[in-house]
């Protein structure tokens, strides 16, 4: 029942061009190139894309034409390797061009940079943006794709087309509005925040596939789809998992045309078979393609079937437990995961995967024992502490969040994580802790039944950001250990880390704590980041500082900024009062 075309095409590039249409084809090739060559100027990429598109058109006209039978990796790789400044701009990535496919593509993939050295995107004035949009709409939208793709080299390409469509709609509507800024800015903020979240979620999918393999991704997908589609039978869920795995494997592997094409096919299949999948799909399936795919990916969980029987009968009490496990391990474990997940929309996916792993480990041991049934009879009792651990953690942290508010909750996490892994760079600690802190506003408002899936699965996404950033420049064995040992136990691994007693405190540097009048013109968010950067540095200097000491210093710092920003001669105030603050802080912390 596979939805994907198995027939061979004489020309793969012609096949994809015809399936996707010229507009999507060009957009996806641009995304692919920008995700591979993240430093190349926009104009260079547009030129390469136009050349590929013209070539694709010749193949559509005649599939037997020269080079039309080549694979997409060969065609795209050859095109990327024509870039004149490859060695100067990318260094050893240029060595990829000496390799043959498929090694060349693997080489390009390995050089994708999660934290490229690119300037922060600064939003121009609304009138400037509207003029640019009206002057050349096509270039304006291509520039958006390019800028997002190069900064987010694993962004889910078909979803980026959906973002671009919304971006275009925002400008089309708001550039005609009476108050352009009031109309446009909230929409752009929403797109930016959703885009960052989408990028991080996809990064976890790619890390799961690339670092832990297809089996790990499939297990994640079985659990999530079973929660979402609890009325669907296991065979249906398995089929969706197989197809979804293919889609994400392609996108994570840089095969963006195949990925977008197969995602469209999967959406079509789901909508044609919604009666046997979920009652919640009706509205999604009435939408155009990009909206439809996005809507399906975000669709709410269907209601659980009534009167689902206890799992114990089939998975503990049955005489055939070990026979099933021996005959088809992964199918049997998949069935267990499906049955458990459809009954527990209140559990996080990672918790469900931990339970499945515990069940697997128990069967592995017990099915080789003298009395297997006696050995595994109490396996469900082992689940209790695994369930209670995230429940308690979420309860405690939501209480702390409600007590402190988001900013101070982030600060508590900044201190906590800096003490756990002080070797990690300050920008990474600030970024990750700020995102960890957002779990409060995102999830604590939910009722009990929705808190755990919201919180723990979100934390998995954020901790993966830490893992991919740390992998680029590894500095902490503890981070490496938590990131690589088990995908589903990353969060418990980080939670269990105590203060790193081996850490040698950083030398005090007054420059780190020197501030200038420019802080006064920053947005509230940027000002918070400055203060949080200082907080991390404080902890790195004095890892044994108490909460009270740190709070006192931070309160003094906030008062200092507020005072100097109100002063007539701000710069003098920052210079003089700053010295006093540093001295007072050193005394308070015993530096």
């Amino acid at each position: 029942r596979g939805v994907f075309r198995r027939d061979a095409h004489k020309s793969e590039v012609a096949h994809r061009f015809k399936d996707l249409g010229e507009e999507n084809f060009k957009a996806l090739v641009l995304i692919a190139f920008a995700q591979y060559l993240q430093q190349c100027p926009f104009e260079d990429h547009v030129k390469l894309v136009n050349e590929v598109t013209e070539f694709a058109k010749t193949c559509v006209a005649d599939e037997s034409a020269e080079n039309c039978d080549k694979s997409l990796h060969t065609l795209f790789g050859d095109k990327l390797c024509t870039v004149a400044t490859l060695r100067e701009t990318y260094g050893e990535m240029a060595d990829c061009c000496a390799k043959q496919e498929p090694e060349r593509n693997e080489c390009f993939l390995q050089h994708k940079d999660d934290n490229p050295n690119l300037p922060r995107l600064v939003r121009p004035e609304v009138d400037v943006m509207c003029t640019a949009f009206h002057d050349n709409e096509e270039t304006f939208l291509k520039k958006y794709l390019y800028e997002i793709a190069r900064r987010h080299p694993y962004f889910y390409a078909p979803e980026l087309l959906f973002f671009a469509k919304r971006y275009k709609a925002a400008f089309t509507e708001c550039c005609q509005a009476a108050d352009k800024a009031a109309c446009l800015l909230p929409k752009l903020d929403e797109l930016r925040d959703e885009g960052k979240a989408s990028s991080a979620k996809q990064r976890l999918k790619c890390a799961s596939l690339q670092k832990f393999g297809e089996r790990a991704f499939k297990a994640w997908a079985v659990a999530r789809l079973s929660q979402r589609f609890p009325k669907a039978e296991f065979a249906e869920v398995s089929k969706l998992v197989t197809d979804l795995t293919k889609v994400h494997t392609e996108c994570c592997h840089g095969d963006l045309l195949e990925c977008a094409d197969d995602r469209a096919d999967l959406a079509k299949y789901i909508c044609e078979n919604q009666d046997s999948i979920s009652s919640k799909l009706k509205e999604c399936c009435e939408k155009p393609l990009l909206e439809k795919s996005h809507c399906i990916a975000e669709v709410e969980n269907d209601e659980m079937p009534a009167d689902l029987p206890s799992l114990a009968a089939d998975f503990v009490e049955s005489k055939d437990v070990c026979k099933n496990y021996a005959e088809a391990k992964d199918v049997f474990l998949g069935m267990f995961l499906y049955e458990y997940a459809r009954r527990h929309p209140d559990y996080s996916v990672v918790l469900l995967l931990r339970l499945a792993k515990t069940y697997e480990t128990t069967l592995e041991k017990c099915c080789a024992a003298a009395d297997p049934h006696e050995c595994y009879a109490k396996v469900f009792d082992e689940f209790k502490p695994l369930v209670e651990e995230p429940q308690n953690l979420i309860k405690q942290n939501c209480e702390l969040f409600e007590q402190l508010g988001e900013y101070k909750f982030q600060n508590a996490l900044l201190v906590r994580y800096t003490k756990k892994v002080p070797q990690v760079s300050t920008p990474t600690l600030v970024e990750v802790s700020r995102n960890l802190g957002k779990v409060g506003s995102k999830c604590c408002k939910h009722p009990e039944a929705k808190r755990m899936p919201c919180a723990e699965d979100y934390l998995s996404v954020v901790l993966n950001q830490l893992c991919v950033l740390h992998e680029k420049t590894p500095v902490s064995d503890r981070v490496t250990k938590c990131c690589t040992e088990s995908l589903v136990n990353r969060r418990p691994c980080f939670s269990a880390l105590e203060v790193d007693e081996t850490y040698v405190p950083k030398e005090f540097n007054a420059e780190t704590f020197t501030f200038h009048a420019d802080i006064c013109t920053l947005s509230e968010k940027e000002r918070q980041i400055k203060k949080q950067t200082a907080l991390v540095e404080l902890v790195k200097h004095k890892p044994k500082a108490t909460k009270e000491q740190l709070k006192a210093v931070m309160d003094d710092f906030a008062a200092f900024v507020e005072k100097c920003c109100k002063a007539d001669d701000k710069e003098t105030c920052f210079a003089e009062e700053g010295k006093k603050l540093v001295a007072a802080s050193q005394a308070a912390l015993g530096l």
């Epitope: 296991f234 065979a235 099933n324 088809a328 069935m335």
Partner: nanobody, 123 residues
Framework: QVQLNESGGGMVQAGGSLRLSCAAS????????AGWFRQAPGKEREFVAA???????TYADSVKGRFIISREYAKNTVALQMNSLKPEDTAVYYC?????????????????WGQGTQVTVSS
């Protein structure tokens, strides 16, 4: 606990067709292997066909190409479409189920059984 109830049996001329249906109650059996067995007077109960969770099917050589086993998840049923019937197909047909990934062919491996439905093929 799973209860199985067969229906659709009856008398038919050789060369004719019948469709047997097996309705499960007590729980959904889509993950279960389901099988059809038959017992002619004075003979051992024998395997006819089986289907597993992903609709992989197996058949006894004597019915291959003539009988089709299928399942419908929404209705929690398993069916046996019997075509080109022969007098030697006359028997009581039983539906059986077991929670197994790979559908067994031997009756002793099945946990749940229906009461049976009579099929008579006259020449």
């Amino acid at each position: 606990q799973v209860q199985l109830n067969e229906s659709g049996g009856g008398m038919v001329q050789a060369g004719g067709s019948l469709r047997l249906s097996c309705a499960a109650s007590g729980r959904t059996v889509s993950n279960y292997a389901a099988g059809w067995f038959r017992q002619a007077p004075g003979k051992e109960r024998e395997f006819v066909a089986a289907i597993n969770w992903n609709k992989t099917t197996t058949y006894a050589d004597s019915v291959k190409g003539r009988f089709i086993i299928s399942r419908e998840y929404a209705k929690n049923t398993v069916a046996l479409q019997m075509n080109s019937l022969k007098p030697e197909d006359t028997a009581v047909y039983y539906c059986a189920a077991v929670f197994r990934i790979v559908a067994p062919k031997t009756q002793y491996e099945y946990d749940y059984w229906g009461q049976g439905t009579q099929v008579t093929v006259s020449s």
